[in-house]
Interface confidence: low
């Protein structure tokens, strides 16, 4: 055998070496990688030294048989079937209160015929649930609400008024209250006609004002 | 383990309209954030997305094939549906439905179908 | 339409060389702090595959030899050390409006 070499590299089971034929002079770098589904065990890099011996014991290839930590997701506690995560483990995520689950809430460590085992799905997100809008309520009989959205986000006010001759009984306006879900603060107010007096004190103030004939005021009353 | 599979006619004459089946397992529509969508794929060319349906029943469409398109779901038994309108030869192509993740951005498409190839021929 | 032009159409690089593959958008598919960018690996006959998400995000289950980068209108697919079996064809798409499309394609092959 060469003195002014390193000693042979052999090939490793379940991996390959590269260069697959490397000089064995001084400086040389060999890099071992294992096939899919194993990992390097020791160092991957070898280098040949000064002394002509390599830097390192020649490493192995050993089978994966865990997942990797799919990790912590924020605003989430995790429960684990298992430490290590080998596989048939499961990781299941509940988001905490005032967030949603974005994803799949549990995951499953399966084995691949090919490759490293896999988690069956990525890990989720826990979202800010968004506030849900209030729907919107119906304008009460006799009087209007505005503005007139089918929903209103949380936050929102709306007001309500009544026709001439009705009265509002209840609130004028309420208001879209944040929460899960939101809601009003009050219920809706209604228009209740104003007393027969004040009704008929009212229509004549309009007549004594409408000039004569008036279709508008046919239409009115 | 999630996996999606598709299914359609293989033949079909100019004109008709194309149907097409996606049934999937390892996940539910009616998870938030869960979208499956239709990309195509003529034989040696690229991909075209064509449509997709968030777990929302929002749907949305490859403006150039709107007024053809049609995507559906049938959430209790795990399939999602597109049509396409007054098919063509050039309608010929592989069609994959795939799945994706909406978390606060639309992600790629993770998971796909093996395909199905759809021929239109006179 | 959002167009997303890839280069080059086609690549040679050696056994354990670098691949390094472009895409290019019309207009920029960044926004809030997010580069709506995927890269994906198609073989002949199979489904494409998700190798890359939101421009540098490695998708689980691929090898680290695969990174992206990029934002706004210019994006990079790199391979390193590229290996024999990532001879085939390369795509990026963009998720940043509809349509969503994607670009032409690049094939790679090993010299």
């Known amino acids: 055998p060469r003195n002014d070499t390193c000693p042979e590299l052999p090939e490793i089971p379940n991996g390959w070496k590269s260069p697959s034929q490397p000089e064995l002079v001084h400086g040389t770098v060999v890099t071992y990688q294992c096939y899919p589904g194993y990992q390097v065990v020791g160092s991957s890099v070898l280098m040949c030294q000064w002394d002509l011996t390599w830097s390192e014991d020649l490493p192995s290839c050993q089978r994966v048989t865990s997942c990797h930590d799919p990790g912590d997701v924020e605003h989430s506690r995790r429960l684990i079937s298992s430490p290590k995560f080998p596989v048939g483990a499961t990781v299941q995520y509940i988001c905490d209160q005032g967030f949603v689950l974005m994803g799949s809430s549990i995951l499953t460590c399966h084995d691949r015929q090919a490759g490293s085992p896999k988690w069956s799905d990525r890990a989720p997100k826990c979202l800010l649930e968004q506030l849900k809008p209030c729907h919107g309520l119906s304008a009460p009989e006799n009087g209007a609400r505005s503005p007139e959205k089918q929903l209103h986000p949380a936050g929102a006010t709306i007001h309500f008024s009544c026709a001439p001759g009705y009265v509002l009984k209840g609130q004028a306006s309420i208001k879209c209250v944040p929460g899960h879900p939101s809601h009003w603060s009050d219920p809706p107010p209604i228009c209740r006609a104003a007393s027969l007096d004040g009704f008929y004190n009212s229509r004549s103030l309009d007549v004594a004002k409408a000039p004569a004939a008036s279709s508008t005021l046919d239409a009115a009353h | 383990q999630v996996t999606l599979k598709e299914s359609g006619p293989g033949i079909l004459q100019p004109s008709q309209t194309l149907s097409l089946t996606c049934s999937f397992s390892?996940?539910?529509?009616?998870?938030?954030?869960?979208?499956v969508g239709w990309i195509r794929q003529p034989s040696g060319k690229g991909l075209e997305w064509l449509a997709h349906i968030w777990w929302n029943d929002n749907k949305y469409y490859n403006t150039a094939l709107k007024s053809r398109l049609t995507i559906s779901k049938d959430t209790s038994n795990n399939q999602v549906f597109l049509k396409i309108a007054n098919v063509d030869t050039a309608d010929t192509a592989t069609y994959y439905c795939?799945?994706?993740?909406?978390?606060?951005?639309?992600?790629?498409?993770?998971?796909w179908g093996q395909g199905t190839l759809v021929t239109v021929s006179a | 339409d959002l167009v997303l032009t890839q280069s080059p159409a086609s690549l040679a690089v050696s056994l354990g060389q670098r691949a390094t593959i472009s895409c290019r958008a019309s207009?920029?598919?960044?926004?809030?702090?997010?580069?709506?960018m995927h890269w994906y690996q198609q073989k002949p006959g199979q489904p494409p595959k998700l190798l890359i998400y939101l421009a540098s995000n490695l998708e689980s289950g691929v090898p680290a030899r695969f990174s992206g980068s990029g934002s706004g209108t210019d994006f990079t697919l790199n391979i390193h050390p590229v290996e024999e079996e990532d001879a085939t064809t390369y795509y990026c798409q963009h998720s940043r409006e509809l349509p969503y499309t994607f670009g032409g394609g690049t094939k790679l092959e090993i010299k």
């Open positions: 795939a799945r994706m993740v909406y978390y606060d951005y639309d992600g790629g498409f993770a998971y």
């Open positions: 207009e920029s598919v960044s926004t809030s702090g997010y580069s709506y």
């Open positions: 390892g996940f539910s529509l009616i998870t938030y954030g869960i979208g």
